[in-house]
């Protein structure tokens, strides 16, 4: 069972008084509609809150919005609606906050039917002041900032025009018409697709992919017969219609679209889809949907070029295009990902990989936990994690799994212990080692958040009744204290803390309801007095990530290196602080065959680490062989796994073979066999 508050465990002395002195209530003087909250900048303490209230009238919708600003992490708010001339703000566009610490904010206003264009309010001083700007177009999408220069904005109009501003929305220029999708790339490059014959939908599969590197002065067409495109890490992907049928295939570029290579992935039909699950500068996880309405597909992992793919996981749950998948990057430990598979019996099971998709396993059963009714064997079962799919199915799961890069090893998630995900009320589980081992942390569903880089975990019970109690732990969820933050319970709507988990403030949002009115209210609690002192060297202990067997010489080696971290000792009640930087020490491992993937035309027989030549090329492998670039077809059978840093040890050197000779097929004409694509 989860540790209770009554156990003789890490009590923080006088915490009630300390927290009471640091609890700040703010009642918002408006009717309850919707509320959205945005943090402006990093470590600035600036929060913008937009409340909107809709009254649907017979002919039109009357709306009212209010804008509030805090500069002390939510302890106090000031009504700044007058700065935006009491204009109604369109919530579907949200608040467009600039990258990094630019202090830029764009709000998109609702305008009356007959107007020539939309209206935005712009701030470049962390929302202290706003400038109203009337647009020469009606925006279809939220303004998109260039990641490299926050003065550069792009937006699509309702007329499918691509508009760019070079002076943070002051002046706008339409750089192209008939645009379906536009994205910023690196170095202020814009990629976009265009249609020729009427509409994006009608031309799907016949779109052109364009690039501009000078904000619209010049253009280059970098792809035709495009269905869609995506960016991930240093890779540009496009799904391209095949010449001969209605299937499409993925092509990849690592030079901004100048040259393309066919990816060695299965082609998909009209009802299927590709999805980039995760990507970094080393590699990409790609989901390829199965034919038919199965709700699952296959995960493939790429090589360092994004060209050769290894099958990573079968029966991967992914409902429909843009639908639900539980695929989660565990950001608190390198190489770890969690997702769900759909079993043959249609039950859903959780799988985890610790080596970037090389191997997937079930999650280890938490210590001292019983297997539930889904388990055939009451002693052998696994932990199954609730994520996006469970939330979409309206199960009693208020939050997806949580991990933070600066709270090393910590993963918090709702789950059940059995043979598959259960529809019963879940509990909250925690791992302190990146998912290798788990412990029940809290009984029943909760909202949770990480503060002070893992120094504090805060949780609130998920309940339909009003609440007035918050729980917190200073030892990675082993022991919990409860604090009553208000006499009068509120209907809870959300927990908010500054992104990045460095803050020591938490805001509890909700509303009060009386006979006639209901009002938004927030309580901001600062935990600084709970963690009275700054952490010192003696408060940290050394931890080896990915350790499974200390007797193994290469214990902890993942992708060719191991990492030791300084982690806060569980009993230390102190502040990591806002400037906390994770201290880690990497050490390179010797290479083994596990550090290499099989190159195109090779495979690993079961329970063998050697790559063996495929006797014949079939299906999408044959297509890749026929149409792929020649230099990708000469190989010694091995390629280092992307991001692998091993040195020495095994070096699988053998003769280089030209697989082009194997590209023969009776089904294709000789001229097609000789052709090759760029």
């Amino acid at each position: 069972s989860a540790p209770g508050e009554d156990e003789e465990c890490g009590r923080v002395r006088d915490f009630v008084a300390k927290l009471a002195n640091n609890t700040h209530q703010h009642v918002f003087d408006d009717l309850r509609g919707s509320v959205s909250l945005s943090w402006v900048g990093d470590s600035t303490g600036v929060i913008l809150v937009l409340t909107t209230f809709h009254v649907p009238l017979v002919i039109m919708t009357f709306g009212q919005s209010k804008l509030y600003r805090s500069e002390d992490y939510g302890k106090n708010f000031k009504d700044i609606t007058d700065l935006i001339n009491n204009t109604f703000i369109r919530t579907e566009f949200g608040m467009a906050i600039g990258p990094e610490n630019s202090g830029k904010v764009v709000l998109t206003a609702e305008v009356s039917g007959g107007s020539r264009g939309g209206r935005i309010f712009r701030s470049s001083d962390f929302a202290k002041n706003f400038v109203q700007t009337d647009l020469p177009f009606h925006p279809l999408t939220q303004m998109m900032y260039s990641p490299q220069n926050s003065d550069y904005l792009l937006a699509l109009s309702t007329e499918n025009g691509l508009w760019v501003s070079k002076n943070f929305g002051g002046k706008w220029e339409e750089i192209h018409k008939a645009v379906c999708l536009a994205k910023w790339g690196s170095d202020n490059t814009i990629f976009f697709t265009t249609y020729a014959n009427g509409s994006c939908k009608a031309d799907l599969g016949a779109l052109e992919l364009w690039r501009t590197s000078d904000l619209g002065k010049s253009f280059k067409t970098i792809g035709v017969k495009i269905y869609s495109f995506g960016l991930g890490g240093r890779f540009l992907f496009a799904s391209v219609m095949a010449d001969k049928d209605t299937t499409r295939r993925i092509h990849v570029s690592t030079d901004q679209g100048d040259t393309w290579s066919m990816a060695q992935l299965p082609s998909v039909g009209q009802e299927q889809f590709y999805s980039i699950l995760a990507a970094n500068d080393d590699m990409v996880f790609m989901h390829v949907d199965e034919p038919g309405d199965t709700g699952f597909g296959t995960i493939f992992t790429s090589d360092d070029r994004g060209i050769v793919y290894s099958k990573s996981l079968d029966r991967h749950l992914y409902t429909t295009t843009g639908g639900e998948t539980d695929f989660t990057n565990v950001t608190s430990l390198r190489g770890v990902y969690i997702t769900s598979v759909l079993s043959e019996d249609n039950s859903i099971q959780t799988m985890i990989t610790f080596d970037q998709g090389g191997r997937w396993t079930h999650l280890r059963k938490p210590e001292n936990s019983e297997c539930d009714a889904t388990a055939k064997n009451k002693n052998e079962c696994s932990l199954h994690i609730h994520a996006s799919y469970s939330i979409s199915q309206k199960l009693n799961v208020p939050m997806a799994p949580l991990s933070e890069p600066n709270a090393v090893g910590i993963v918090i998630a709702h789950g059940s212990v059995g043979d598959a995900i259960s529809v019963m009320v879940p509990d909250v589980y925690i791992s302190d080692d990146g998912g290798y081992s788990w412990t029940k942390m809290l009984e029943g569903p909760h909202y949770y958040t990480i503060l002070d880089s893992g120094g504090i975990i805060v949780a609130i019970e998920h309940s339909s009744r009003p609440i007035n109690v918050i729980k917190f732990s200073t030892d990675e969820g082993q022991c919990w204290q409860t604090y009553t933050f208000t006499r009068d319970p509120i209907y809870f709507t959300g927990l908010a803390s500054e992104p990045g988990a460095r803050s020591m403030n938490i805001s509890i949002w909700g509303f009060t309801e009386s006979f006639l009115t209901s009002q938004w209210v927030s309580y901001t609690i600062d935990f600084k007095d709970i963690l009275e002192r700054n952490c010192e060297e003696k408060d940290y202990t050394i931890w080896l990530a990915h350790s499974t067997d200390p007797e193994d010489y290469e214990d902890g080696c993942i992708l060719g290196y191991k990492e030791q971290f300084l982690r806060l000792a569980k009993s230390s009640v102190c502040q990591n602080g806002r400037d906390y930087v994770v201290t880690k020490q990497p050490s390179i491992c010797l290479c083994s065959l596990e550090d290499f993937l099989c190159d195109f035309g090779y495979y690993r027989p079961e329970n063998d680490s050697k790559c063996v030549e495929q006797p014949e090329l079939k299906g999408h492998d044959l297509e890749f062989c026929l149409y792929g670039r020649e230099e990708h077809l000469t190989t010694n059978g091995y390629r280092k796994i992307p991001g692998d840093k091993c040195q020495g040890g095994v070096n699988p050197v053998r003769e280089v073979k030209d697989l082009k000779k194997k590209c023969t097929s009776n089904f294709l004409s000789p001229e097609k066999q000789n052709s090759k694509s760029n």
Partner: antibody, heavy 124, light 106 residues
Framework: QVQLVQSGAEVKKPGSSVKVSCKAS????????ISWVRQAPGQGLEWMGG????????NYAQKFQGRVTITADESTSTAYMELSSLRSEDTAVYYC?????????????????WGQGTTVTVSS | DIQMTQSPSTLSASVGDRVTITCRAS??????LAWYQQKPGKAPKLLIY???SLESGVPSRFSGSGSGTEFTLTISSLQPDDFATYYC????????FGGGTKVEIK
Amino acid sequence: QVQLVQSGAEVKKPGSSVKVSCKASGGTFRNYAISWVRQAPGQGLEWMGGIIPIGGWANYAQKFQGRVTITADESTSTAYMELSSLRSEDTAVYYCARQGRKTGYYYYYGMDVWGQGTTVTVSS
Amino acid sequence: DIQMTQSPSTLSASVGDRVTITCRASQSISSWLAWYQQKPGKAPKLLIYKASSLESGVPSRFSGSGSGTEFTLTISSLQPDDFATYYCQQADGHITFGGGTKVEIK
């Protein structure tokens, strides 16, 4: 079976330094922390500090900070503890011990293998 | 640093007795506690780690319990070989030992 073999007894003058060695055999030396613990005559156990051979990551008890240096040589599977500015109160048996490990935490599972102890006498 | 207080400091008992030694931490250490046995002129020997896990090769008459700040080592039936000094040790953060409990023949 893992064994830790320590260097022989030492007699030292006040103000000087002593360096005690601890050689491991029969196990994976690099993957475990080695702690140094001392015991003055008729007294209890006192932890001085420890080291992880991979990367040489050492940490010390506050009482000995600045006076003790713990090092490790992976190639010979040997850990060393050097104590400087010796005084008569440093007369004790000095033990090296391997920290047991069930997970990635080096110091959380107790010391499962001990050396035989090295007697250091500080006397003028 | 975390202080560890062991009690009693000396304990007189007979063969076959049930013996209990307690150890209190100055702040919560969760379950990160070990127990050792030491005989004169010998190095300590690990009995229990993580408060209640028995080290391999240690007789099952030894058991540990507790979490947070209060811990107990129990010898269910004292044997002649068990007369020795026992130490607790916290392992969360910098290591500290308790003062020891000498179990002597009554």
